[in-house]
Interface confidence: medium
C-alpha cells in the first residue's frame, strides 16, 4: 500500500497472507470458516494446491501459522481479455476458528452501488513505493474513496477497459494506491458493518493522479459465490 | 521485428483434420496472447480462438469449439491449431496473430499478423 | 449475421477526409479496433483502444467513439489508403471478439 500508515489485525480481522512456497504473493479477505475471497490472477503462474498456504491472525507478515488449501476456485480466464473476473475463492482444508484477530467480513449486497467520493479502506503488505523492491514487513492500510468511472476511463487514464465489473478507487491527487503484493486484497466500505466491496485487481503503477487502483467488483460476482458455495456444500 | 511463419494448410476432406502451425520470431514469445482468425474466400474475418502466454487458458468461437485446438510450445516460440471434424465451412485463410500488450490496456486486439495459410475443406 | 455493422463501401476523393463507421451494442462498453486489409495481404492494426496508433500508422488515421457507434477517420486521403477497413471489438456476453463486415474504401 502506497501512502499510508501501519495497521493493527484487531481492526481487520478478516485479512489474511496467501502464500506459496512460503512467500506472500497475495492479500484475501475471510469470508467464512471454510472460504477465502481473492483475485484470480494471484493464481496464474502455479495453480496447484498443495504448496499454497493461507496464513491468518497476525499483522506481521511471517508470524502466523499457516493453514492448508483444499481447493482454488476460478472464473475460468479468458486469454482475449486478462483482466475479466479477477476474482478467486480459496476453500480452506480445516475451518478457521474465530477469534479477536480472525473473523470474516461480509460481502455486498446485489444492489451495492457506491456513489463517487465515497470512502473505502485499502489494507496489505504490498510494496511501499512503485518499484520499491520489497514487501512490507507489517500490515498497512490507507484511506481511499470511489474515483468515478467515467474519470478511471478518461483519455490520461484507462480508455475505456475498466468494465462495469470493475471499480476504481484511489484519490484525485493520487498519491495513496494499492501495489504490488496487495492484489487479493479487500477494498472496504463500512455501513453497519464492513463490506469487501471490492478485490485489489490491476492497475499502472502505484498511486498516480489520473490512474487509480481498479478493483474487482465484488457485488458484480455474488451469483457466481454464491453458486460455488452451494456446488461446495 | 516480429515475423510469423506458418505451415500446415492444403486441401482436406469433410471429416478430415489438419494441424497449422505458427513460428514467431522477434518477439519475446511466452509473454504474449496469441490467437487465430480466419477469412473465408471473398468474406470478411473471423475470430477462432485464443491462448494466454503461458499455454494455460484458451478461448474459441462456438462455430469451432469442440472440433479445434490450439495449443503452444514455448520453448519453440511456435502457435498450432489442431482442427479435426473438419467442414466446408471451415475453408478460409487461416491467420495466426500476437495479441497486444500494452501496458493497461486489455489486449483484445490484433498487433502482428502472420501471411495466412488457405485450408480447403472439399471432397 | 455480425454484431457489429458496417457500410459495405465508401468512396472518398483523394486528398479528402473520410468517415468509416461501425455500430454495434457492444460499443456502447468496449472500444473498437480497425484493421486495414489490402487484397492479398494480411490485415493491419491502424487504431486501437481509444484512439492509438500502432508506430508506423500515419497520423492522418484517428479513432472516435459516441454511444453505440464507433468511426475512423482517415484525414488527407492517400491513394494507398484504398483498402477494406474491419472494426473489431468484443461480442455482446464480453467474452469472444468479434468483427464487423468490413468497409471497400474506394479513392477517387
Known amino acids: 500500500v502506497v501512502g499510508v500508515e501501519e495497521a493493527s489485525v484487531d481492526s481487520w480481522p478478516w485479512q489474511v497472507s496467501i502464500q506459496y512456497d512460503k512467500q506472500h504473493v497475495c492479500g484475501g479477505s475471510i469470508l467464512d470458516p471454510h472460504w477465502v475471497l481473492t483475485a484470480a490472477h494471484c493464481f496464474r503462474k502455479h495453480t496447484d494446491v498443495f504448496n499454497w498456504k493461507v496464513r491468518a491472525g497476525s499483522d506481521k507478515l511471517g508470524s502466523f501459522p499457516s493453514l492448508a488449501v483444499a481447493k482454488i476456485i476460478i472464473i475460468e480466464f479468458n486469454p482475449m481479455y486478462p483482466k475479466d473476473n479477477d476474482i478467486a475463492l480459496m476453500k480452506l482444508q480445516f475451518p478457521l476458528t474465530f477469534s479477536g484477530t480472525v473473523r470474516p467480513i461480509c460481502l455486498p449486497f446485489f444492489d451495492e452501488e457506491l456513489t463517487p467520493a465515497t470512502p473505502l479502506w485499502i489494507i496489505g503488505w504490498g510494496f511501499t513505493k512503485q518499484n520499491g523492491g520489497k514487501m512490507s514487513d507489517i500490515l498497512l492500510q490507507a484511506s481511499v474513496q470511489v474515483i468515478d468511472s467515467t474519470r478511471c476511463n478518461a483519455d490520461d487514464a484507462y480508455q475505456g477497459e475498466v468494465t462495469e465489473k470493475m471499480m476504481c478507487a484511489g484519490i484525485p491527487e493520487g498519491g495513496v494506491d494499492t501495489c504490488q503484493g496487495d492484489s487479493g486484497g479487500p477494498l472496504m466500505y463500512q455501513s453497519d458493518q464492513w463490506h469487501v466491496v471490492g478485490i485489489v485487481s490491476w492497475g499502472y503503477g502505484c498511486g498516480g493522479p489520473s490512474t487509480p487502483g481498479v478493483y474487482t467488483k465484488v457485488s458484480a460476482y455474488l451469483n457466481w459465490i454464491y453458486n460455488v458455495w452451494k456446488a461446495e456444500l | 521485428q516480429v515475423q510469423l511463419v506458418k505451415s500446415g494448410g492444403g486441401l482436406v476432406q469433410p471429416g478430415g483434420s489438419l494441424r497449422l502451425s505458427c513460428a514467431a520470431s522477434?518477439?519475446?514469445?511466452?509473454?504474449?496472447?496469441m490467437s487465430w482468425v480466419r477469412q473465408a474466400p471473398g468474406k470478411g474475418l473471423e475470430w477462432v480462438s485464443a491462448?494466454?502466454?503461458?499455454?494455460?487458458?484458451?478461448n474459441y468461437a462456438d462455430s469451432v469449439k469442440g472440433r479445434f485446438t490450439i495449443s503452444r510450445d514455448n520453448s519453440e516460440n511456435t502457435l498450432y491449431l489442431q482442427m479435426n471434424s473438419l467442414r466446408a465451412e471451415d475453408t478460409a485463410v487461416y491467420y495466426c496473430?500476437?495479441?497486444?500488450?500494452?501496458?493497461?490496456?486489455?489486449?483484445?486486439?490484433?498487433?502482428?499478423w502472420g501471411r495466412g495459410t488457405l485450408v480447403t475443406v472439399s471432397s | 449475421s455480425y454484431e457489429l455493422t458496417q457500410d459495405p463501401a465508401v468512396s472518398v476523393a483523394l486528398g479528402q477526409t473520410v468517415r468509416i463507421t461501425c455500430q454495434g451494442d457492444?460499443?456502447?462498453?468496449?472500444?473498437a479496433s480497425w484493421y486495414q486489409q489490402k487484397p492479398g495481404q494480411a490485415p493491419v492494426l491502424v487504431i486501437y483502444?481509444?484512439?492509438n496508433r500502432p508506430s508506423g500508422i500515419p497520423d492522418r488515421f484517428s479513432g472516435s467513439n459516441s454511444g453505440n457507434t464507433a468511426s475512423l477517420t482517415i484525414t488527407g486521403t492517400q491513394a494507398e489508403d484504398e483498402a477494406v477497413y474491419y472494426c473489431?471489438?468484443?461480442?455482446?456476453?464480453?467474452?469472444?471478439?468479434?468483427f464487423g463486415g468490413g468497409t471497400k474504401l474506394t479513392v477517387l
Open positions: 496473430a500476437v495479441l497486444g500488450r500494452e501496458q493497461y490496456l486489455a489486449r483484445g486486439y490484433f498487433e502482428h
Open positions: 522477434g518477439v519475446n514469445f511466452n509473454n504474449y496472447a
Open positions: 491462448i494466454s502466454g503461458s499455454g494455460a487458458s484458451t
Open positions: 457492444s460499443l456502447r462498453s468496449y472500444y
Open positions: 483502444g481509444k484512439n
Open positions: 473489431s471489438s468484443r461480442d455482446s456476453s464480453g467474452n469472444h471478439l468479434v
